[in-house]
């Protein structure tokens, strides 16, 4: 239903502070250098005409569209030119070329330093001091440095750290207690982000249709007991919240999500058996609860479909009369049948059965020639199933931190092009799958392993994007979304790349490295193994683990050692001259 | 080709116990479902049990307690451990195993319960 002022129906029904957390993020997603303070500014500003508009809907600018109030706000801030630069010509546009502007100047790699945790005492006392500023600095930082994240899930986050923070300030121990419970929150939210961030890139790429299908396809594998109405009615809503959220409309985005919450709740007999949890939960959880909800028992008598799909004479018939719903039929009884399969690969599938038809429903014989489709499954079938055997067997033989390494090397091969920064960044990420996924049951592999990939390469290739460098990086980047993964893993050696020249300063370290965390040590290991494998692409496995032994024995040698300095200046140059010739 | 081959079936006491093992031979690949089923003398062909891909279970409500229905992936496998056996149980047992392409069945085996 129309509202006579939009501002003042999402006031209402989101509340005041979910309706101020989600304006700081928008701000906060399109002005990604602003301080927290010049976005706080901003929020209050708006919230204060929202309560103006909902005491009068009739008063002056409450009738106008929220991109409109927003972009306004946005382009009166001061030097803005200064600060952003081109960004500042989007003000000179209307709605609604103006707001896509703005999206198009989202930066998915700013330039702003890592997001560092205060220690516990100092984070407890801004907590305590005003947990409302301490909460919009979560927000503000975390957006900005992830300009698509799900900002309905990002208010969720919030509450947790919020949550968290409440328990830990009042034990003794403050700091175990935080550490792993927000590096906990953390890693979900850097995965939560990547996983958007597919989404927003699907949508912008391919449109909605292509969303549709994925969400069609996972649906279908968490709910297969609902029906195919009910499926396309909830692929439908999922598919409008996350198109609103990618573009920007955060308020409409979160409210039809509690809508799409309160639907799910309200129909649980023909949707799961499983919701009911989630159900007993407030907005926030319910919402992120419902999203990861375990899949419904299979039904435990499907048939085959065979007879509907390959066997039935009006295939060609039924397929031409309303193409996407019986392919999206197909999606739906192919999925609900495959839990144990990711996303990508259905996708893959249905992809393949469309294909098959186009060419066979224009034949002289079309049930002679689409007669064998679904045998010529099995290849797509059997390729992601060695992918995760292969790659969760080397997990389990390697560890996390070598099976990093692995892909390290083996991306660095594939793309030597790409900055070491990014190449490491990819390989701990794409490393982490296996402790993430290769400990699940067998049936929960495949589409761990394969989906959470695919997310990740489509940050690489969001970030090649930016500067193209590679001729392999662009020919899987600019493929479909559901071919990339398969794209990458059939990469080998670039043999058009001229190797690096040596640099012993490359391979130099200093004694500082020894006080630095865990995970900075390994970063500057991994980007000296990339930096190798660009040296000598063509090193095997052998040479380059003699080298990174070496290496590690030096570094634990010279940390150890009374005069640090002297061990890391007199033993580096002689660690140099053995990389050299072990690499020689 | 696929072949499906079960074994195990046989006579036995009531409260007496039998393993059904069934193995399927040939290229089968993307199993969704399997399952057992059973005929007595002059009845329909009724599901006994059924194992899903997720590893979700079914019984028939007159085996529940007694029966248990396991998979083995790698082997393509599926048994029925039937304990506490019934006269009522006495029937050929079928094993079939599904995937999007088809359904395919066993020859049965018999199993009789009988003092």
């Known amino acids: 239903e129309a509202h006579k002022s939009e501002i003042a129906h999402r006031y209402n029904d989101l509340g005041e502070q979910h309706f101020k957390g989600l304006v700081l993020i928008a701000f906060s997603q399109y002005l990604q250098k602003c301080s927290y303070d010049e976005h706080a500014k901003l929020v209050q500003e708006v919230t204060d005409f929202a309560k103006t508009c909902v005491a009068d809907e009739s008063a002056a600018n409450c009738d106008k569209s929220l991109h409109t109030l927003f972009g306004d706000k946005l382009c009166a801030i001061p030097n803005l030119r200064e600060n952003y630069g081109e960004l500042a010509d989007c003000c000179t546009k209307q709605e609604p070329e103006r707001n896509e502007c703005f999206l198009q100047h989202k930066d998915d790699n700013p330039s702003l330093p890592p997001f560092e945790r205060p220690e516990a005492e100092a984070m407890c006392t801004s907590f305590k001091e005003n947990p409302t500023t301490f909460m919009g600095h979560y927000l503000h930082e975390v957006a900005r440095r992830h300009p698509y994240f799900y900002a309905p899930e990002l208010l969720y986050y919030a509450e947790q750290y919020n949550e968290i923070l409440t328990q830990c300030c009042a034990e003794a121990d403050k700091e175990s207690c935080l550490t792993p419970k927000l590096d906990g929150v953390k890693e979900k939210a850097l995965v939560s982000s990547v996983r958007q961030r597919m989404k927003c890139s699907s949508m912008q790429k391919f449109g909605e249709r292509a969303f549709k299908a994925w969400a069609v396809a996972r649906l279908s594998q968490t709910f297969p007991n609902a029906d195919f109405a009910e499926i396309t009615k909830l692929a439908t809503d999922l598919t409008k919240v996350n198109k609103e959220c990618c573009h920007g409309d955060l308020l409409e985005c979160a409210d039809d999500r509690a809508e799409l919450a309160k639907y799910m709740c309200e129909n649980q007999a023909t949707i799961s058996s499983k919701l009911q949890t989630c159900c007993d939960k407030p907005l926030l959880k319910k919402a992120h609860c419902l999203s990861e909800v375990e899949h419904d028992t299979m039904p435990a008598d499907l048939p085959a479909i065979a007879a509907d799909f390959v066997e039935d004479q009006e295939v060609c018939k039924n397929y031409a009369e309303a193409k996407d719903v019986f392919l999206g039929t197909f999606l739906y009884e192919y999925s609900r049948r495959h839990p144990d399969y990711s996303v990508s690969l259905l996708l893959r599938l249905a992809k393949k059965y469309e294909a098959t038809l186009e060419k066979c429903c224009a034949e002289a014989n079309p049930p002679a020639c689409y007669g064998t489709v679904l045998a010529e499954f099995q290849p797509l079938v059997e390729e992601p199933k060695n992918l995760v055997k292969t790659n969760c067997d080397l997990y389990e033989k390697l560890g996390e931190y070598g099976f990093q390494n692995a892909i390290l090397v083996r991306y660095t091969q594939k793309a030597p092009q790409v900055s070491t920064p990014t190449l490491v960044e990819a390989a701990r990420n794409l490393g982490r799958v296996g402790t993430k996924c290769c400990t699940l049951p067998e049936d929960q592999r495949l589409p761990c392993v394969e989906d959470y990939l695919s997310a990740i390469l489509n940050r690489v290739c969001l970030l090649h994007e930016k500067t193209p460098v590679s001729e392999h990086v662009t020919k899987c980047c600019s493929g479909s979304l559901v071919e990339r993964r398969p794209c990458f893993s059939a990469l080998t050696v670039d043999e058009t790349y001229v190797p690096k020249e040596f640099k012993a300063e490359t391979f130099t370290f200093h004694s500082d490295i020894c006080t630095l965390p865990e995970k900075e040590k390994q970063i500057k290991k991994q980007t000296a193994l990339a930096e190798l494998v660009k040296h000598k692409p063509k090193a095997t496995a052998e040479q380059l683990k003699t080298v990174m032994d070496d290496f590690a024995q030096f570094l634990d040698t010279c940390c150890k050692a009374a005069d640090k300095d002297t061990c890391f200046s007199t033993e580096g140059p002689n660690l140099v001259t053995r990389c050299k010739d072990a690499l020689a | 080709q696929v072949q499906l081959q079960e074994s195990g079936g046989g006579l036995v006491q009531p409260g007496g116990s039998l393993r059904l093992s069934c193995v399927a031979s040939?290229?089968?690949?993307?199993?969704?479902?399997m399952g057992w089923y059973r005929q007595a003398p002059g009845k329909q062909r009724e599901l006994v049990a059924s194992?899903?891909?997720?590893?979700?279970?079914h019984y028939a409500d007159t085996v529940k307690g007694r029966f248990t229905i396991s998979k083995d992936n790698a082997a393509n496998m599926v048994y029925l451990q039937m304990n506490a056996l019934e006269p009522e149980d006495t029937a050929v047992y079928y094993c079939?195993?599904?995937?999007?392409?088809?359904?395919?069945w066993g020859q049965g085996t018999q199993v009789t319960v009988s003092s």
């Open positions: 040939g290229s089968i690949w993307g199993i969704y479902h």
């Open positions: 194992i899903t891909v997720d590893g979700s279970t």
């Open positions: 079939d195993i599904r995937n999007v392409g088809g359904d395919y």
